[in-house]
């Protein structure tokens, strides 16, 4: 649950983030957990921990391994583990799977892709961008901040995007670079105001005490790729994030489906062992895009025991 | 907005036992510590022991060690703290309180009063 | 245990007064990491105490400016410039360095 994978290549700089968190957190400590030994905290060191984050200034492939970090406060410790592997540079250009942080998705209105982990690093703008091992020029390709703009997205765009960048320590740069898949939706298409297919409006759903229950938003948008198109539920007009009730989740990432060629999202929320003051809160499931937002609500009722009949 | 709702005002009688509720909301229970803090009639205050609700260790102050417990529900997000032995000294304002990331005591709840009497 | 000892016990003051209250702790609140842990809060009659200030000098979310602490490893003061008239109440410092936590015995601040 507290481990994260982290991955690099050799003679470049590796920052990683201990996976756990502390509330309060006073310091954090970082071990190699195979020896046991302390990570050292002194800059002069080529891998030294600070604070919640460990630093491989430059990395090597020896420096493969998993890292315990504890994180300390006064009350409680708490203990992560980052699963690091640092890989030889490839000769040729193709970049392989293991080294691939997550695939995005763009299209002509939107086509914003984020240089992955950058965050952690101290860089100065701009930063580099490749395509396929290019480096690419002309007006349609513009770095801002710490991602790529590609104006008038084509499906010839697809591909993998490198970014490349300083990270500077101490008056030491260290080169960084991360990839990542694009690729390119079909932009042919519309959009219109919400239709909420699921749940009907004011339906009342009927789910047993003690039981787990799902409830779908779904709602469709228009036609293909849609901007700005989102599905949520509500409790009591409050944010599921933000009501703070553990067993009540919603499913994380939306689920794009295209039913009769329109573009609808779905999302779940599910609750855990079915308590009665669930029976008392108002849930409302809401789709929204530019054109607006529509909102249908749900109740629970308990559902009667069937009646057996030999 | 984070809310820390105890339970309502005790009377007890000497050498029997309390528990007291505090339900969370507005933010993700099992992130952040609960910690329990006592109040006597007229007088400062005086930590008492946590838990962290992720896992359900706990520490307590010397002076309470062997008489308090504190648990937690992750389910309903709720942390209790229950106070045994009780002697007419225990009378007093309990409060929860909960940290954030920077800091213990970010968060308190009403107070609960319990009185011990015979 | 480390002791938090406040002074004085009580003080008059009027509106738009500074108003000082001093804090001394038993052993250096200064941890390894270079934070100072000392707190303090603002406790009306009936009410739970209120955060306001922490480690040492930052202000929580939504204190006014006229709050504003400072101090050493030790020796520590909360400064109100000018008291309000809702300013009124009772103000202990706190130490969440080492277990068990500890408060001072508390300063009541009364309308003179």
């Known amino acids: 649950k507290f481990s994260k994978q982290s991955w690099g290549l050799e003679n470049e700089a590796l920052i990683v983030r201990c996976p756990r968190q502390g509330k309060p957190s006073y310091t954090v400590d970082w071990y190699y957990s195979q020896t046991n030994k302390s990570i050292p905290t002194q800059e002069r060191n080529r891998v030294f921990a600070s604070g919640q984050l460990l630093k491989f200034l430059p990395a090597a492939v020896a420096d493969s391994g998993i890292y315990t970090c504890i994180v300390r406060s006064p009350t409680f410790n708490r203990t992560g583990y980052a699963n690091v592997t640092i890989y030889k540079k490839q000769s040729d250009c193709n970049v392989p799977d293991y080294l691939m942080y997550s695939t995005v998705s763009g299209s002509e209105k939107n086509s914003k892709i984020y240089c992955p982990t950058i965050d952690l690093y101290n860089w100065t703008a701009p930063l580099e961008w490749f395509k396929n091992c290019q480096a690419l020029q002309g007006s349609r390709y513009r770095a801002h901040k710490s991602f790529l703009v590609i104006d008038n997205v084509m499906t010839e765009d697809a591909g993998d995007y490198t970014c490349k960048f300083i990270h500077n320590e101490n008056g030491a740069n260290y080169s960084v670079t991360a990839t990542r898949s694009f690729t390119v939706k079909d932009e042919q298409g519309f959009s219109l105001f919400p239709v909420i297919g699921a749940p009907a409006q004011n339906e009342i759903k009927e789910v047993e005490i003690g039981k787990n229950a799902n409830l779908t938003c779904s709602a469709c948008f228009g036609k293909g790729t849609q901007f700005l198109a989102a599905v949520l539920w509500q409790l009591n007009g409050t944010k599921i994030t933000d009501f703070g009730e553990p067993r009540i989740q919603q499913e994380e990432g939306q689920n794009q489906s295209f039913s009769n060629g329109l573009a609808c999202l779905d999302m779940v929320l599910r609750i855990a062992d079915v308590k009665e003051e669930d029976l008392l809160l108002q849930y409302d499931c809401l789709a929204l895009n530019l054109h607006g937002l529509r909102r249908h609500t749900v109740r629970l009722s308990r559902k009667n025991p069937i009646d057996h009949h030999s | 907005e984070v809310q820390l709702v105890q339970s309502g005002a005790e009377v007890k009688k000497p050498g029997a036992t309390v528990k007291i509720s505090c339900k969370a909301s507005?933010?993700?229970?099992?992130?952040?510590?609960m910690h329990w803090v006592q109040q006597a009639p007229g007088k400062g205050l005086e930590w008492m022991g946590a838990i962290d609700p992720e896992t359900g260790d706990t520490v307590y102050a010397e002076k309470f060690q062997g008489r308090v417990t504190i648990t937690a529900d992750k389910s309903s997000s709720t942390a209790y703290m229950e106070l045994s032995s009780l002697r007419s000294e225990d009378t007093a304002v309990y409060y929860c309180?909960?940290?954030?990331?920077?800091?213990?005591?970010?968060?308190w709840g009403q107070g609960t009063l319990v009185t011990v009497s015979s | 245990d480390i002791q938090m000892t406040q002074s004085p016990s009580s003080l008059s003051a009027s509106v738009g007064d500074r108003v000082t209250i001093t804090c001394r702790s038993s052993?250096?609140?200064?941890?390894?990491?270079?934070?100072?842990?000392l707190y303090w809060y603002q406790q009306k009659p009936g009410k739970a105490p209120k955060l306001l200030i922490y480690?040492?000098?930052n202000l929580a979310s939504g204190v006014p400016s006229r709050f504003s602490s400072s101090g050493s490893g030790t020796d520590f003061t909360l400064t109100i410039s000018s008291l309000q008239p809702e300013d009124f109440a009772t103000y202990y410092c706190?130490?969440?360095?080492?277990?068990?936590?500890?408060f001072g015995q508390g300063t009541k601040v009364e309308i003179k």
């Open positions: 052993k250096s609140l200064l941890h390894s990491n270079g934070i100072i842990y």
């Open positions: 507005g933010y993700i229970f099992i992130d952040s510590e």
């Open positions: 480690q040492l000098s």
């Open positions: 309180t909960g940290s954030t990331t920077d800091y213990y005591f970010a968060y």
């Open positions: 706190a130490q969440n360095l080492e277990l068990p936590f500890t």
